[in-house]
């Protein structure tokens, strides 16, 4: 079948924009670290890169293949306020490269890390 | 309390980067429209803007206040393959402005639409 060049171009553009790669996302600090419900952070979120996007096949998942760690300083507030907001420096995982992996590859990668 | 200017600057930067605003995201076409399980799209995802980011209070949600619609052409594949991939043009919601709304404001907005 022959398809209009414009259609093919726009589809190719969509492929590129949605590919599996590190993307800037907002991470809820409290949820990321499962902190106590009486502890809050200001700002409540930080911006980091995490793998995201779509893979060509349903059996594949977009996963990080390398990670760096970013230190960010935030204000921590504990209720009831025994003291004012205190600056805390927290380290966040920042995905630097990604790959579409089969679900079994993901399983193997995860289990090889937790067995160490 | 007096805080280091660098700390305040980096925190302010984090606030700005994580604020509630339209963000480029990948949308799974099949999931967005709840299509039949034997229908696939190539690419499976499209890139659109959706509201995202964090609000200053737990009682608030980042919601769209205005939306445009983008038409995108994709290949639709139906299994079993009675014919080759056919180009289809689909309209996707693209959030153009956002606001942090209380959960009840979200309720009001949603329920006023479905009552029309």
């Amino acid at each position: 079948a022959h398809y209009n060049t414009e259609i093919l171009k726009s589809i190719d553009n969509e492929w590129r924009k949605t590919q599996c790669m590190p993307r800037e996302v907002c991470i809820d600090v409290g949820k990321e670290f499962g902190v106590a419900t009486n502890t809050f952070f200001k700002p409540p979120c930080v911006s980091v890169y995490r793998c995201g996007g779509c893979c060509n096949s349903e059996g594949l998942q977009c996963m990080n293949t390398s990670t760096s760690y970013l230190s960010k300083t935030l204000f921590e507030i504990t209720v009831p306020l025994s003291q004012g907001p205190k600056p805390v420096t927290i380290s966040f995982a920042n995905h630097t490269s990604c790959r579409c992996m089969s679900k079994l590859d993901v399983y193997r990668q995860v289990h090889s890390i937790i067995r160490r | 309390a007096h805080y280091n200017t660098e700390i305040l600057k980096s925190i302010d930067n984090e606030w700005r980067k994580t604020q509630c605003m339209p963000r480029e995201v990948c949308i799974d076409v099949g999931k967005e429209f709840g299509v039949a399980t034997n229908t696939f799209f190539k690419p499976p995802c499209v890139s659109v803007y959706r509201c995202g980011g964090c609000c200053n209070s737990e009682g608030l949600q980042c919601m769209n206040t205005s939306t445009s619609y983008l038409s995108k052409t994709l290949f639709e594949i139906t299994v079993p393959l009675s014919q080759g991939p056919k180009p289809v043009t689909i309209s996707f919601a693209n959030h153009t402005s956002c606001r942090c709304m209380s959960k009840l404001d979200v309720y009001r907005q949603v329920h006023s639409i479905i009552r029309r």
């Epitope: - | 009682g59 209380s102 309720y107 479905i114």
Partner: antibody
């Protein structure tokens, strides 16, 4: 006309569970948010929970959070309140009420009495 | 949580005379959409509550015009221009600007 009929109330021991139902008729149930409101004997009104028209969002009063679950079945035009770990202070008449766009209530059922007692 | 304070606690009125109930909220009920989410309900003896007034001053369908609501921000009033025997019961104000929704403690109206 709008009708809401609660059922499922009764006497229950502390720590036990109970499920209340509210049968709705006279309006398109699937287009309305719904609430549960309660009233302890001789006391004022206390809002308990809200559920969105499609069941996608639910919010609760702190006094019942983690113990009560609001749900709905739009195919049966029925609202539910699953109550667990019941306490003496949950003794009340429980009303279901239809939500307005403003998130208040316009029509109420007659109520069903829940008594938590050993 | 927003605290709703109603006064008086009870009211004894002669038929045909006016009555007034006050409701004060601990914070403004004026929302960013320009609406004020304050409602009035009447609970007659042995019955469920019924909606009287929507968003401060709008009478709900079927509510007699002797009932009127007014106010703004944090101060609201329900007035009955001429009390009738059927108006007895407990009146409640409600805020729905934010969760949790909260009611006033109620004002009991009886006939002298």
């Amino acid at each position: 006309q709008v009708q809401l009929v609660e059922s499922g109330g009764g006497v229950v021991q502390p720590g036990r569970s109970l499920r209340l139902s509210c049968a709705a008729s006279g309006f398109t149930f699937s287009r309305y948010g719904m609430h549960w409101v309660r009233q302890a004997p001789g006391k004022g009104l206390e809002w308990v929970a809200i559920i969105w028209y499609d069941g996608s969002d639910k919010y609760y009063a702190d006094s019942v959070k983690g113990r009560f679950t609001i749900s709905r079945d739009n195919s049966k035009n029925t609202l539910y309140l699953q109550m667990s770990s019941l306490r003496a202070e949950d003794t009340a008449v429980y009303y279901c009420a239809r939500g307005t766009v403003g998130a208040s209530f316009d029509y109420w059922g007659q109520g069903t009495l829940v008594t938590v007692s050993s | 949580d927003i605290v709703m304070t109603q006064t008086p606690l009870s009211l004894s009125v002669t038929p045909g005379q006016p009555a007034s109930i006050s409701c004060k909220s601990s914070q403004s009920l004026l929302n960013s959409d320009g609406k004020t989410y304050l409602y009035w309900y009447l609970q007659k003896p042995g019955q469920p509550p019924q909606l009287l007034i929507n968003e401060v001053s709008n009478r709900f369908s079927g509510v007699p015009d002797r009932f009127s609501g007014s106010g703004s921000g944090t101060d609201f009033t329900l007035k009955i221009s001429r009390v009738e025997a059927e108006d007895v019961g407990v009146y409640y104000c409600l805020q729905s600007i934010q969760l949790p929704l909260t009611f006033g403690g109620g004002t009991k109206v009886e006939i002298k």
